[in-house]
């Protein structure tokens, strides 16, 4: 008996061939001996089976002695033995229909679990192997689970169902709902305008939800909500915003926030959360603001940074085109009695400058100028 594997929702074509290459009498029936379809000359007749409106053949092939049974929009319950009777011979084909579906939705939040469930006909014992877009293989029986979905898990999952040495392949598109970056740092000089961007790592036709940015300033004892907003069909509308600082928000995606000026009291870290409609859980993106200030007070030239900096960052003060006068893994450096000229304050990481602020030191009889 020939075995054919089919996929739920797909179309399958079961073949039946006669020795005579001409249109002759044939019919297909199921294991319950119920007629599915047959021919009357060059015309097709349909039996009373439950397949009725989904069963078909190819009349164009009959003259070549081929009498296929085509079953459209396959259901698991179509799994059966189908018998083609042509001339005085019987051809039996066992059709096994499988379905593979994602637990609840194919759009899942980062960190959530993905469960793939295999629907299979009674009596079958298939094995399933799935390969994620990042090349990770998982194996299982009726269910396969992947916990803690990552952004790289977005894309097409290819699953192979194996039964009776035959295989059928399923492709499931999974969208991991996340921000493109889990965390970002913005480095600004005091007084500069700050732009925070929160690009999403996915695109959907309609995006509805609500969000909030909580901010923990380095100098503050507790965090506070800077802004709350709604998202409706990709349109952003601000619900509530603090007066200090007074953030501005873009009306379209990607989510975009503007802080009029970087000030030491704003330096710190924030957490933008986005709750999407019909989804349990929230998307998160951490954002950090580092603010630099260079000042000269009497005979002291000081450079300071506020905000979350890593211990390996180097803060330096140097006279233009000269070696650094002072360089430390600290958040403040200073030079006493700096010589006149353009001084640079640099925040760097392994030689890469992240932030720089220039300050002009005038000869001692005059006051300093900050460009």
């Amino acid at each position: 008996k020939k075995v054919v594997l089919g996929k739920k929702g797909d179309t399958v074509e079961l073949t039946c061939t006669a020795s005579q290459k001409k249109s002759i009498q044939f019919h297909w029936k199921n294991s319950n001996q119920i007629k599915i379809l047959g021919n009357q000359g060059s015309f097709l007749t349909k039996g009373p089976s439950k397949l009725n409106d989904r069963a078909d053949s190819r009349r164009s092939l009959w003259d070549q002695g081929n009498f296929p049974l085509i079953i459209k929009n396959l259901k698991i319950e179509d799994s059966d033995t189908y018998i083609c009777e042509v001339e005085d011979q019987k051809e039996e084909v066992q059709l096994l229909v499988f379905g593979l579906t994602a637990n609840s939705d194919t759009h899942l939040l980062q960190g959530q679990s993905l469960t793939l469930t295999l629907e299979s006909p009674p009596g079958s014992s298939p094995s399933v192997q799935c390969r994620s877009p990042r090349g990770k293989n998982i194996q299982g029986g009726k269910t396969l689970s992947v916990s803690q979905l990552e952004l790289q898990d977005s894309g097409t999952w290819t699953c192979t169902v194996l039964q009776n040495q035959k295989k059928v392949e399923f492709k499931i598109d999974i969208v991991v709902l996340a921000f493109q970056k889990a965390s970002s740092i913005v480095y600004k000089k005091e007084g500069e305008q700050v732009e925070f961007s929160f690009p999403l790592a996915f695109t959907v036709e309609k995006l509805t939800g609500s969000g909030e940015l909580w901010w923990q300033a380095e100098r503050a004892s507790s965090s506070k909500s800077w802004i709350t907003f709604d998202l409706k069909n990709k349109e952003v509308s601000v619900k509530r915003v603090t007066q200090d600082p007074k953030l501005q928000m873009g009306k379209k995606l990607p989510l975009h926030l503007t802080l009029p000026q970087a000030l030491p009291q704003y330096a710190g870290s924030g957490n933008l959360t986005l709750a999407l409609e019909a989804k349990t859980g929230k998307l998160h993106q951490e954002v950090n603001l580092v603010v630099m200030r260079a000042t000269q007070l009497q005979k002291n030239l000081t450079c300071e940074v506020w905000g979350p900096t890593s211990p390996k960052l180097m803060l330096s003060l140097k006279l233009e085109n000269k070696e650094a006068k002072v360089s430390k893994r600290e958040k403040a450096v200073w030079v006493l009695n700096p010589e006149a000229g353009m001084w640079q304050c640099l925040l760097s990481d392994s030689g890469q400058v992240l932030l720089e602020s220039n300050i002009k030191v005038l000869p001692t009889w005059s006051t300093p100028v900050q460009p």
């Epitope: 009498q25 000359g41 009373p48 005085d88």
Partner: antibody, heavy 118, light 111 residues
Framework: MVHLQESEPELVKPGASVKMSCKAS????????INWVKQRTGQGLEWIGE????????YYNEKFKDKATLTVDKASNIAYMQLSSLTSEDSAVYFC???????????WGQGTLVTVSA | DIVLTQSPASLAVSLGQRATISCKAS??????????MNWYQQKPGQPPKLLIY???NLESGIPARFTGSGSGTDFTLNIHPVEEEDTATYYC????????TFAGGTNLEIK
């Protein structure tokens, strides 16, 4: 020329069975399906079932599946229909029929009258 | 099962005039460009005679006075001009799916 010759009229008692025949000639018997149709006096036509003469498989109208049994004898080109547990409702003319090159029943037997009476 | 409704139940037409009989199916009987509707004529004591198959095809040996038309669920048999010998009962029948079903018939009388 295609010809379907049906058996003689039958007078049978209620509860009994009857087996009628339809002899085909003028064509290759196994190339066409034989259908059976019932017509009560002054009434319409009802399809009972069909026999695929090549394989011998028969399919029935749900209404007649416990009433009729269709068989064929390929060697003698004869199709048979047996009706069981007869009642007055089964009194009718029974036709065998074969399709032509189209979708309709182009060739008919002359009919076998079955009368069920005590 | 597909139910066929034929109208009128009886019809009297003058010799030489047109007789029109309609047949309505409870669902479409079209498949792959063909309409699986047939028309028969039956005279008392005789088996039915196939006139039209696949809605509009004239069976061989049937006069061209008989024409069939329609598709989907609505079909018509026309006889023009009617002749004396056309007095009979006419049936439509679908062969789209099993069980094939017949309508109740139309008795045609020639005046």
């Amino acid at each position: 020329m295609v010809h379907l010759q049906e058996s003689e009229p039958e007078l049978v008692k209620p509860g009994a069975s009857v087996k009628m025949s339809c002899k085909a000639s003028g064509y290759t018997f196994t190339d066409y399906v034989i259908n059976w149709v019932k017509q009560r006096t002054g009434q319409g036509l009802e399809w009972i079932g069909e026999t695929y003469t090549g394989s011998g498989s028969s399919y029935y109208n749900e209404k007649f599946k416990d009433k009729a049994t269709l068989t064929v004898d390929k060697a003698s080109n004869i199709a048979y229909m047996q009706l069981s547990s007869l009642t007055s409702e089964d009194s009718a003319v029974y036709f065998c029929a074969r399709r032509g090159k189209g979708t309709g029943f182009a060739f008919w037997g002359q009919g076998t009258l079955v009368t069920v009476s005590a | 099962d597909i139910v066929l409704t034929q109208s009128p139940a009886s019809l009297a037409v003058s010799l030489g005039q047109r007789a029109t009989i309609s047949c309505k199916a409870s669902q479409s009987v079209d498949y792959d460009g063909d309409s699986y509707m047939n028309w028969y004529q039956q005279k008392p004591g005789q088996p039915p005679k196939l006139l039209i198959y696949a809605a509009s095809n004239l069976e061989s040996g049937i006069p061209a006075r008989f024409t069939g038309s329609g598709s989907g669920t609505d079909f018509t048999l026309n006889i023009h001009p009617v002749e004396e010998e056309d007095t009979a009962t006419y049936y439509c029948q679908q062969s789209y799916e099993d069980p094939p079903t017949f309508a109740g018939g139309t008795n045609l009388e020639i005046k």
